[in-house]
Amino acid sequence: EPTMYGEILSPNYPQAYPSEVEKSWDIEVPEGYGIHLYFTHLDIELSENCAYDSVQIISGDTEEGRLCGQRSSNNPHSPIVEEFQVPYNKLQVIFKSDFSNEERFTGFAAYYVATDINECTDFVDVPCSHFCNNFIGGYFCSCPPEYFLHDDMKNCGVNCSGDVFTALIGEIASPNYPKPYPENSRCEYQIRLEKGFQVVVTLRREDFDVEAADSAGNCLDSLVFVAGDRQFGPYCGHGFPGPLNIETKSNALDIIFQTDLTGQKKGWKLRYHGDPMPCPKEDTPNSVWEPAKAKYVFRDVVQITCLDGFEVVEGRVGATSFYSTCQSNGKWSNSKLKCQPVDCGIPESIENGKVEDPESTLFGSVIRYTCEEPYYYMENGGGGEYHCAGNGSWVNEVLGPELPKCVPVCGVPREPFEEKQRIIGGSDADIKNFPWQVFFDNPWAGGALINEYWVLTAAHVVEGNREPTMYVGSTSVQTSRLAKSKMLTPEHVFIHPGWKLLEVPEGRTNFDNDIALVRLKDPVKMGPTVSPICLPGTSSDYNLMDGDLGLISGWGRTEKRDRAVRLKAARLPVAPLRKCKEVKVEKPTADAEAYVFTPNMICAGGEKGMDSCKGDSGGAFAVQDPNDKTKFYAAGLVSWGPQCGTYGLYTRVKNYVDWIMKTMQENSTPRED
């Protein structure tokens, strides 16, 4: 327990102290006081350095004194023979005696009292940064005007923190600038701008003078900038050592100015402003930016347009441009969006043709359509090559996005007709010689396939049966064979408007305009046994001359039988119309003069008894195309005759080409278009 005073006496005092003694006393006075220790009697065996017997005074780790021998007071008015003054509140006194004393020594008497210390002056380390005030038992620190005492109650500093700057432009300086800044202070300034703006700090070298770094390079006073997880500084010295323009990349900046107790200089002054946050000019492949600028900043909007053949895809929808905004975080909105090659998708299939599976369906890819040769060809040209265009369509140089159309090749038999062994009035034929040949079973007659949907025949064949059953692709018309051939179903029959309909057709003498078209319900698939015949051209090249040869085919009456089971054919020359007129009608149903002959009729035959006959009606009189010797066209249709085995009359098809084309056009279906 600390005391304000006390007495210390050597053992047995005032008697002689014993040998071989060691005794210590711990003196403690209250905090804030020093100790005044004084001896009023001292009689201890004398030795060099007091090595034998001694009284030792220790303060902390320091020996304040070591006493031995005899002392007497120098002052007749004072009993003090030795004294010690320590500015601390603790002191230790140790008395030692050795094993022998040559004389009788009485030891010592000492007293201590608590004394006031002046903390402001008694210590090497000054306790206060500014003003020190001593009082009995303690002291207190105080500060000059505009300074405040820190929590440690010793150090003074200026109140320079807490300022928040939100304006887009401003100036900040150290306290008292350009007068010396306060020592022992920590100044914190906060700049807080709107999101999307970065703080940019600018300084001039001459506006900065802060106590220089120590020999180890550590700033004693320092200026530091902190932006998020980035730090600029610490900076100190004469003239600003950092970059004169600091782009913080942040809308929030903390400025920290720390000073120590010594070495004040004029300080610093800086300016700051808010720069719109820059966004990088990103390399977005296959696109262009509008507007194009060297630098983009917060709130800038660009339109990013994909190059031709590229698009941005959202589900099944594509767009060729989009907008992107430079955002407050320095990043572009919609940066995920990428211009990717347009995908034209799997190309559409076409009737009677094919397209190879493409390796790629992306922009720039090429595909090729082909028709099923040799039965179909590409009608609308363009070569069949399509490329994937920028708009996502497969495009042909000639047709654009229109698909190629595979239409039947006309007039080309798979096997040419050769007159083999002579059969009365004609030869056996194969359907491959006449793949256009159509068989009508009621009445027993013929027709010519002219395209996928249309059959050309004689009007008198269909006038009595508007829903005829027709077959193609078979040489034999035996019932068992027909079952295996292709049956055609009519949709509508179109008889030429110039054909006169009679109540009693058997008595007909006028076969003018003996032509009709049958529209089929379904398209016919072409092949080696089914293929159309061409129509005549409208030029004079297709005007027939006497002697021009043509082929007829059918299952009509022969010399031996009323009806042929296997296809027969013959090659006949064109003859003058008068030759037909001169032949006597075999079984006249009227006066010979009543029979009508018109320019719409072709006369042919008269050679070696070759002729068409009952049951061949409607079949084609096929003539080699003058402009393409590989093809045949239907120059005529078997119509009527005065007598089988002589001359026959055929409807002159060239005169009806316009009607045929118009009828087909007006009655086509979207599927055919």
Epitope: R299, V312, E314, V317, Y323, S333, N334
Partner: antibody, heavy 116, light 107 residues
Framework: EVQLQQSGAELVRPGALVKLSCKAS????????MHWVKQRPEQGLEWIGW????????IYDPKFQGKASITADTSSNTAYLQLSSLTSEDTAVYYC?????????WGQGTLVTVSA | DIVMTQSHKFMSTSVGDRVSFTCKAS??????VDWYQQKPGQSPKLLIY???YRYTGVPDRFTGTGSGTDFTFTISSVQAEDLAVYFC?????????FGGGTKLEIK
Amino acid sequence: EVQLQQSGAELVRPGALVKLSCKASGFNIKEYYMHWVKQRPEQGLEWIGWIDPENGDTIYDPKFQGKASITADTSSNTAYLQLSSLTSEDTAVYYCARSRLFFAYWGQGTLVTVSA
Amino acid sequence: DIVMTQSHKFMSTSVGDRVSFTCKASQDVRTAVDWYQQKPGQSPKLLIYSASYRYTGVPDRFTGTGSGTDFTFTISSVQAEDLAVYFCQQQYTTPYTFGGGTKLEIK
């Protein structure tokens, strides 16, 4: 089939926070932006913000800054909206939506009711 | 922020009529405007994107026009099932903003 399945309705006390989820199926959220939209009873639509789940980047309407926090977990293909310091003004249906070019797909919505 | 204004809160029409909704942007948004339909108790559904493009599966009676600041959404022949609120939205720049909506009522 693209679907956005949102978590169920929430009844919360004022001052509390709530976390809503939006589980995506039929697509990978990393390839899209995931948005959150607020609709107060009988009122219009308010865009809250979006997240790019690929890198975690977010953008908010300034009026929802501090109120809303959007996150995403790509492993579960789910986007989240956390709302803090709730008041009666936060009572609304919250929708998540997917976009690249436009908000083509929306969740069914989650009703959040703030009541003492 | 860009403000999208739909001046009519309500519009009343009859089945078969033609009806148009307007939306005005407070600044130029080029063609970055989408239109959404929200039926009672349902989530919004995209009808028109980029001002004039019909989204997949949307009937062709719905059309959109406009660019810059003025946009129009039209239903050429209103059907009973079109009863809904129609919102415009700009996606020109963040924050994306919606119009207040126009409620279509069938007489």
